[in-house]
């Protein structure tokens, strides 16, 4: 049994780190493998993660962790029974992928404006809470040529779009993702998308 692609891990900077790797051949990850991890810290214990399959030769493990601080460093050992397949380390603060924003809602009852709101995925006491900026993707199922990215670089998780910039009488979808500039993170996954119908019509005089 051999590791084809070494484990690569990312942290959500809250409580979960996700490690993914590829094996040399088809593997029942949960039955054959264990990923052991231990914080390099006085009197810390070794913890075990049972991986799941992620495609035929891929495995993924979700490591339960404490709140992340910059000093945290974990040792990682990938075992197949009594055989050590790989040994490495992981510093969560240097490999951050934020959680996806949630509760994306579209408010169309605001005059002349489409208001999108979503929730910050972190509690106020988390360091990422005040560092997230967002990208909102809006596209139309009726008009495949229409897709826009709106960068939200302010803290408030809202975006206002003049309804007049969207075509009337067709449906749109939106989704949002986040990243944290000062932590040099990757982008989060996209939130689930939400759909709305743009029924806005310009006043007669402006037509």
């Amino acid at each position: 049994m051999k590791v084809l692609q070494e484990p690569a891990c990312v942290s959500d900077y809250m409580s979960i780190s996700t490690c993914e790797w590829k094996m040399g051949g088809p593997t029942n990850c949960s039955a054959e493998l264990r990923l052991l991890y231990q914080l390099v810290f006085q009197s810390s214990e070794t913890h075990t993660c049972v991986p799941e399959n992620n495609g035929g030769v891929g495995c993924v493990c979700h490591l339960l962790m404490d709140d992340v601080v910059s000093m945290d460093n974990y040792t990682l050992d990938l075992w197949a029974g009594q055989q050590l397949l790989w040994k490495g380390s992981f510093k969560p603060s240097e490999h951050v992928k934020p959680r996806a924003p949630g509760n994306l809602t579209v408010h169309t009852n605001v005059s002349d404006t489409v208001l999108l709101t979503w929730s910050n995925p972190y509690p106020p006491d988390n360091y990422l809470y005040n560092d997230l900026t967002y990208a909102v993707n809006i596209w139309s199922e009726n008009d495949p040529a229409y897709s826009r990215i709106h960068n939200v670089t302010y803290l408030k998780p809202t975006l206002r779009i003049p309804a007049s910039t969207l075509k009337s009488g067709i449906s749109y979808r939106a989704r949002v993702r986040a990243w944290a500039q000062h932590y040099n993170t990757t982008w989060s996954e996209w939130s689930p998308s939400t759909k709305w119908y743009n029924s806005y019509r310009e006043p007669f005089e402006q037509r």
Partner: antibody, heavy 125, light 112 residues
Framework: EVQLVESGGGLEQPGGSLRLSCAGS????????MTWVRQAPGKGLEWVSS????????YYADSVKGRFTISRDNSKNTLYLQMNSLRAEDTAVYYC??????????????????WGQGTTVTVSS | DIVMTQSPLSLPVTPGEPASISCTSS???????????VDWYLQKSGQSPQLLIY???KRASGVPDRFSGSGSGTDFTLKISRVEAEDVGFYYC?????????FGQGTKLEIK
Amino acid sequence: EVQLVESGGGLEQPGGSLRLSCAGSGFTFRDSAMTWVRQAPGKGLEWVSSISGSGDGTYYADSVKGRFTISRDNSKNTLYLQMNSLRAEDTAVYYCAKDRLSIYIRPRYYGLDVWGQGTTVTVSS
Amino acid sequence: DIVMTQSPLSLPVTPGEPASISCTSSQSLLYSIGYNYVDWYLQKSGQSPQLLIYLGNKRASGVPDRFSGSGSGTDFTLKISRVEAEDVGFYYCMQALQTPYTFGQGTKLEIK
């Protein structure tokens, strides 16, 4: 009441052995790392050894490494210090102390918040 | 190993007056914001040590509020706002960031 009670001290000749015990009560013993600290007559405090809650992680001062062994029996709520190849400089009062909570991914530290009454070890010919 | 240096080693104090003990470590004891792994212990004559302050500034359960800890990184201070006769004994700082845990030499507080 949270309590630690040491026993097993005594007079031993150089090169001899002693086994110290520390019985814990009033707290969930297996959740806490434990530590041994000693104090030679008229001297300050010196850390000797520590062990994680499960017993998998053990740590020793250079002065006792290879001679002393720390262990624990969580079913008996008891900490041990096996002392071999004793030397005159091991003469001291030995204290056990409750250390950090190691059930967490990053063990929670509240100081060495409970100490035993101490047991005296004298190494002399 | 981390070296802990205490001063003064002897501290005569008049009851009711404040007292201050300093402790310097040879490397930073700050693990994360607000978490300095330094403790203060008091050992009274013929007794086991007792915890006063942990993580630099957190008062242990049952410790009178006249005791306070401060500092960060490598420089730490234990203050007693008004010394009482029962406060006599040896005071030790200890680093618990990593093993070997190391203690300061001890400060003997006595009443003038």
